[in-house]
């Protein structure tokens, strides 16, 4: 049985792969910061880490997906204060008891050094320095990407 | 109804020590950040410490790093400020204060417990 | 550290008065500024979060203004609960800074 929350990251997900293909993204639109392949919106107002989940969908985007050690140290580049913590778009799973990403992977234990506890409505935040396990319920900004598409020419069948 | 309340002030020797406690009721504790006030007598408001909700992430004043540590309990809802190397300069009443990420206000605060460090 | 910077440190008023208080930073903080009261023995009170914001409970009587480093807090008609020391503090970055504070004391 899935908590509420992994239901919503489950829907939010499904909703996003049944819309249509949009065309590529070539530039970060405004107020978004382009972080190599990606464009990422820092929000300014707090939020439970469902509600950030939510938004970022509203936006025709994901909470931030992170790769690898290096994009993290490159996103938290980009945080300007050690007090400010950001969800991301990982979570606890309680029927799986493994951290999971709301694109269905689970967390490389190698990629993330989380400090706090794996449990029941536990969510991931990052600041400057660290990556920490919050209570979901706590009312922190949020990260939301864009993937940029580099666009490639077709290449049509003569006719 | 949030509620507040700071205990464990009380007249301390310079380079003594003491630990402060706030116990939290009304909401749910550990989804906030909670931070320490301090006021001089006849003085302004000097922020000195913050922590997460879940304890994992802290914050000082330069003027407290190395000698306070802030804490909490959860599970008992409290929050907990142990000082030590006391000086002079910081005797004052010390204030429990929901909030402490950026960019969050204190909106609750507790009624206040007075520190004297003198000999 | 960012300085906050009260204007006037202290003022005599009249209960139904318009009072004004500024804030200054010594650098731009967006909206992120608060302004609290406080009472003689008293732990201080939220007035105005986010610059602007009212909290809930709080007189719609009092106002705040500005963005960047400049700011206003605002009592349209005092009253005699008003007379209080008033604060403002910048939560934009760490160490969260106050003001030395302003004293409306009666006139």
């Known amino acids: 049985q899935k908590s509420s929350i992994e239901k919503c990251s489950v829907d939010i997900q499904q909703s996003r792969n049944k819309t249509t293909e949009r065309p590529g993204l070539l530039n970060c639109p405004i107020y978004w910061q382009q972080l190599r392949e990606k464009c990422l919106l820092f929000s300014h107002t707090v939020n439970p880490w469902n509600n950030s989940l939510a938004d970022c969908s509203t936006k025709e985007s994901s909470l931030l997906l992170i790769r690898d050690k290096d994009e993290l140290i490159h996103t938290q580049n980009l945080i300007r204060d050690k007090a400010i913590l950001f969800w991301i778009g990982l979570n606890f799973s309680l029927s799986e008891k493994n951290w999971k990403w709301i694109n269905g992977s689970f967390l490389n234990s190698n990629d993330l050094e989380i400090r706090g506890d794996a449990k029941e409505n536990s969510c991931i935040s990052i600041s400057q320095t660290s990556v920490y396990s919050e209570y979901c319920s706590t009312e922190i900004r949020w990260i939301c990407q864009k993937e940029l598409t580099p666009v490639r020419n077709k290449v049509y069948p003569d006719s | 109804e949030v509620q507040l309340v700071e205990s464990g002030g009380g007249l301390v020797q310079p380079g003594g020590s003491l630990r402060l406690s706030c116990a939290a009721s009304g909401f749910t504790f550990s989804s906030y950040a909670m931070s320490w006030v301090r006021q001089a007598p006849g003085k302004g408001l000097e922020w000195v410490s913050a922590i997460s909700g879940s304890g994992g992430s802290t914050y000082y004043a330069d003027s407290v790093k190395g000698r306070f540590t802030i804490s909490r309990d959860n599970s008992k809802n409290t929050l907990y400020l142990q000082m030590s190397s006391l000086r002079a300069e910081d005797t004052a009443v010390y204030y429990c204060a929901r909030g402490g990420y950026l960019p969050d206000a204190f909106d609750y605060w507790g009624q206040g417990t007075l520190v004297t460090v003198s000999s | 550290d960012i300085q906050m910077t009260q204007s006037p440190s202290s003022l005599s008023a009249s209960v139904g008065d318009r009072v004004t208080i500024s804030c200054r930073a010594s650098?731009?903080?967006?909206?992120?500024l608060n302004w609290y009261q406080q009472k003689p023995g008293k732990a201080p009170k939220l007035l105005i979060y986010a610059a602007s914001s009212l909290q809930s409970g709080v007189p719609s009587r009092f106002s705040g203004s500005g963005s960047g480093t400049d700011f206003t807090l605002t009592i349209s008609s005092l009253q005699p609960e008003d007379f209080a020391t008033y604060y403002c503090?910048?939560?934009?970055?760490?160490?969260?800074?106050f003001g030395q504070g302003t004293k409306v004391e009666i006139k």
């Open positions: 503090q910048q939560t934009y970055s760490t160490p969260l800074t």
């Open positions: 650098q731009s903080i967006s909206s992120y």
